[in-house]
Amino acid sequence: SLETLKALLEVNKGHEMSPQVATLIDRFVKGRGQLDKDTLDTLTAFYPGYLCSLSPEELSSVPPSSIWAVRPQDLDTCDPRQLDVLYPKARLAFQN
């Protein structure tokens, strides 16, 4: 469940994503069959850099509310195509 995932991520809070945690998240998302808003909100809360793994097409469906807590350094590994999608959403999130 999402609550179980949150509890496991809480234990690793403040650390870089380890391969073990990456595997856990990957299996959880695949098990759900899609990346829904609740899951995305949870993942970005603990690992904001997760956004940089999403394609521009996937990012286009991310609501601004999911990225309001993301800092510029969290997007260090995003590419320009991703940032073109994220920056307008971030501006909208901050305005709200």
Partner: nanobody, 111 residues
Framework: QLQLVESGGGLVQAGGSLRLSCTAS????????AKWFRRAPGKEREWVAS???????GYDDSVKGRFTISRDLAKNTVYLQMNSLRLEDTAVYYC?????WGQGTQVTVSS
């Protein structure tokens, strides 16, 4: 933390080809996608190519049609096939995945 190791760089003549590899620790690390960036001497870091979580790809205009990014999930490796290399492709090439960076591999294109 995730460990990324690049290889495959070297000295090549203009017009030649190279294939860079980036291998990650962690069984599903590359299923999150990965990117190649490069830094030429005296220049800012520049994005080269990406393969995303969903398997789609993206390229900077300067390499589109010449470079191809791909991944082998079984080997946990991302590749950058570089063809028709130009002098301006000379740089240190870095792989990144899940907010981790590799140490880089030098690519030098000579005339």
């Amino acid at each position: 933390q995730l460990q990324l190791v690049e290889s495959g760089g070297g000295l090549v003549q203009a017009g030649g080809s190279l294939r860079l590899s980036c291998t990650a620790s962690g069984s599903t690390s590359m299923s999150y996608g990965a990117k190649w960036f490069r830094r030429a001497p005296g220049k800012e870091r520049e994005w080269v190519a990406s393969v995303y979580r969903d398997g789609t790809t993206g390229y900077d205009d300067s390499v589109k049609g010449r470079f191809t990014i791909s991944r082998d999930l079984a080997k946990n490796t991302v590749y950058l096939q570089m063809n028709s290399l130009r002098l301006e492709d000379t740089a240190v090439y870095y792989c990144t995945a899940l907010n981790s960076w590799g140490q880089g591999t030098q690519v030098t294109v000579s005339s």
